[in-house]
Interface confidence: medium
Amino acid sequence: RAVPGGSSPAWTQCQQLSQKLCTLAWSAHPLVGHMDLREEGDEETTNDVPHIQCGDGCDPQGLRDNSQFCLQRIHQGLIFYEKLLGSDIFTGEPSLLPDSPVGQLHASLLGLSQLLQPEGHHWETQQIPSLSPSQPWQRLLLRFKILRSLQAFVAVAARVFAHGAATLSP
């Protein structure tokens, strides 16, 4: 793995994979099915999803001081979204198109999370809230919101890895 018991990931590898995730998240977003945005509502349905916030040490100073705080937060988010994309929200009906990038997105989330997981070290992962609805018309809404939230998450993660690759790589 890229973090063999140490505290520094393979920043360049992580940067490349996170950029790929950004592209996939944006390409997957319009393909979740037709949804009338008037139906969306103001309050965030996926308000339990992980967000990278100020206290998570993902700013340049925090990354220099101890990148593990930020990397753990990113790792938690990646696992969270990876589980969501593998759940019946995305695997259930209505079926995604055969060429949907969601499958690739799912695999890439897992790949990046494995790059960040130190060998023999297990970070706590966040519990997935009971978001799984039984009805397809509700799944469409959740897919839309999850992917929109994922876009924001991977955009921040990509910036973190870009900074790390530029300034923290050995």
Epitope: G41, E43, Q135
Partner: antibody, heavy 117, light 107 residues
Framework: EVQLLESGGGLVQPGGSLRLSCAAS????????MGWVRQAPGKGLEWVSS????????WYADSVKGRFTISRDNSKNTLYLQMNSLRAEDTATYYC??????????WGQGTLVTVSS | DIQMTQSPSSLSASVGDRVTITCRAS??????LNWYQQKPGKAPKLLIY???SLQSGVPSRFSGSGSGTDFTLTISSLQPEDFATYYC?????????FGGGTKVEIK
């Protein structure tokens, strides 16, 4: 025991407004999608609107979109339907229903809304 | 919108008869089909959900089958309390839509 009790129906003139309420008990209200279904006298069932457990998403039938607003107060275990610009064709018994599994598993007794001049 | 077509719109039957009501969707809805019973002046009652699952407390003489576009509600031996109107409903996509109803009357 699950109970859904609608109120707020009555006679209203065309163009008028009414607010229906549905008081829920016997289950954890904030966990469930809730909805309204109506039935015009002597007619079949028509879905009107549904709302996500958190209130963060709503769905409407085209016939009421822009005129009706569904909302909920999870602290009060109450579902609402604000009906504006009422028309004669909105005359119906309005039922509150709880979604469970893939269906509307529990229904209230209904409240009659009559739109007439 | 998905249209739900029920047939027949009404039928006459006797106690003990086997009764079959059909419901057709205008497009595939997989197994997202529910059946309700309604008696005059009362709220609808869920009988069958997900095409074939019997709702808790509903007698086993009621059964549902079908997938895709064609569905059936069967009452194996009609009882006096079964005389009512039956509705199918799809929960595949919004707007959620109901069939026009089938009124089961005493012959």
């Amino acid at each position: 025991e699950v109970q859904l009790l609608e109120s707020g129906g009555g006679l209203v003139q065309p163009g008028g407004s009414l607010r229906l309420s549905c008081a829920a008990s016997g289950f954890t209200f904030s966990y469930y999608t809730m909805g309204w279904v109506r039935q015009a006298p002597g007619k079949g069932l028509e879905w009107v609107s549904s709302i996500w457990p958190s209130g963060g998403a709503t769905w409407y039938a085209d016939s009421v979109k822009g005129r009706f607003t569904i909302s909920r107060d999870n602290s009060k275990n109450t579902l609402y339907l604000q009906m504006n610009s009422l028309r004669a064709e909105d005359t119906a018994t309005y039922y509150c229903a709880r979604d469970r599994d893939t269906a509307m598993a529990d229904w209230g007794q209904g409240t009659l809304v009559t739109v007439s001049s | 919108d998905i249209q739900m077509t029920q047939s027949p719109s009404s039928l006459s039957a006797s106690v003990g008869d086997r009764v079959t009501i059909t419901c057709r969707a205008s497009q595939s809805i997989s197994s997202y089909l529910n059946w309700y019973q309604q008696k005059p002046g009362k709220a609808p009652k869920l009988l069958i959900y997900a095409a074939s699952s019997l709702q808790s407390g509903v007698p086993s003489r009621f059964s549902g089958s079908g997938s895709g576009t064609d569905f059936t509600l069967t009452i194996s031996s009609l009882q006096p309390e079964d005389f009512a109107t039956y509705y199918c409903q799809q929960s595949y996509s919004t707007p959620l839509t109901f069939g026009g109803g089938t009124k089961v009357e005493i012959k």
